[in-house]
């Protein structure tokens, strides 16, 4: 069964910068990836980026740069302008659509150990979740 992993990282040097990494584990070629925050797109979440393998990417603030890392994984850099660092408690969701198989979605957030008050940056560990 295909699975989606989501990993949220805070940049060690800039506490206001976050990166969301998402990947698709399974057969099929990806046609579209949608990244949202605050929940899944369509269920109260806000769309941050849409990535198409051929037609390119669209992104919305506070997304800074969305890109493909491999044919089945993407990364999205975010710039947190607020001093209170709201990203720390936010859920990020990635939905991978593959034709004709369908869509798979997972959500993740910054691990609790990644609190800005801590000196060492977190070790990136994929957050595996069953699709919603």
């Amino acid at each position: 069964t295909p699975e989606v992993w989501v990993q949220v990282q805070m940049e060690a040097t800039e506490l206001s910068s976050f990166t969301v990494h998402c990947g698709f584990l399974g057969p099929g070629s990806i046609s579209l990836v949608t990244v949202s925050w605050g929940g899944p797109d369509g269920a109260g979440g806000t769309k941050l980026a849409v990535l198409h393998p051929e037609l390119g990417t669209r992104q919305w603030a506070p997304a800074r740069q969305a890109r493909w890392e491999t044919q089945s994984s993407i990364s999205l850099a975010l710039e947190d302008s607020g001093a209170s660092s709201p990203f720390a408690n936010t859920t990020f969701c990635c939905k991978f659509a593959s034709f004709p198989e369908g869509s798979w979605e997972s959500c993740g957030s910054l691990p609790p150990s990644s609190d800005p008050g801590l000196s060492a940056p977190p070790t990136p560990v994929p957050i595996l979740r069953a699709d919603l």
Partner: antibody, heavy 120, light 107 residues
Framework: DVQLVESGGGLVKLGGSLKLSCVAS????????MSWIRQTPEKRLELVAA????????YYLDTVKGRFTISRDIAKNTLHLQMSSLKSEDTALYYC?????????????WGQGTSVTVSS | SIVMTQTPKFLLVSAGDRVTITCKAS??????VAWYQQKPGQSPKLLMY???NHYTGVPDRFIGSGYGTDFTFTISTVQAEDLAVYFC?????????FGGGTKLEIK
Amino acid sequence: DVQLVESGGGLVKLGGSLKLSCVASGFTFSSYHMSWIRQTPEKRLELVAAINSNDINTYYLDTVKGRFTISRDIAKNTLHLQMSSLKSEDTALYYCARHEDYYGFAMDYWGQGTSVTVSS
Amino acid sequence: SIVMTQTPKFLLVSAGDRVTITCKASQSVTNDVAWYQQKPGQSPKLLMYYVSNHYTGVPDRFIGSGYGTDFTFTISTVQAEDLAVYFCQQAYRSPWTFGGGTKLEIK
């Protein structure tokens, strides 16, 4: 203007074969996923077969697996559905349709349909 | 496969009425739902995608809502040209499946 024009339907005997064609125009045919959808006499819609833009990944309705084959000829902008061992339940109006990635794979263009009647 | 149960099968309404069609999925399909309109003698036409997004040229009297398993399609003010059969469809998991259709008739 996007257009999809089906042909090849007709009256066929039980167990017979038929090849449907759909000529596409007005868009880059090779960049889109395509499918065949049928509408039964009861007006129910069923996705029969689909093919990814990469021409590798395909889908078939369980009841047509092993009997139907979807393919496309990029040079001729044509989608095909080869149907064999036809059954009475294959009687329907067959549409070809284009899927749009940005619309959640919804079918944004449909042909006018070609009728297939399987008789005993 | 995912079953899309659409109700009602028939609707007899007057021009100007507000009508609602519901579609219930047998499991969550998130927001991967489209709605189509099929006028007599014509092929189906896309009205809405991702539940609530209007396809090009579709009037805003057509409204889609829902998420997960329960979806509604509303025509806020029915017009004579809305005489048609309406279908919901899920594209969340293969095989894509359609609702049974709702035939809208105008008094």
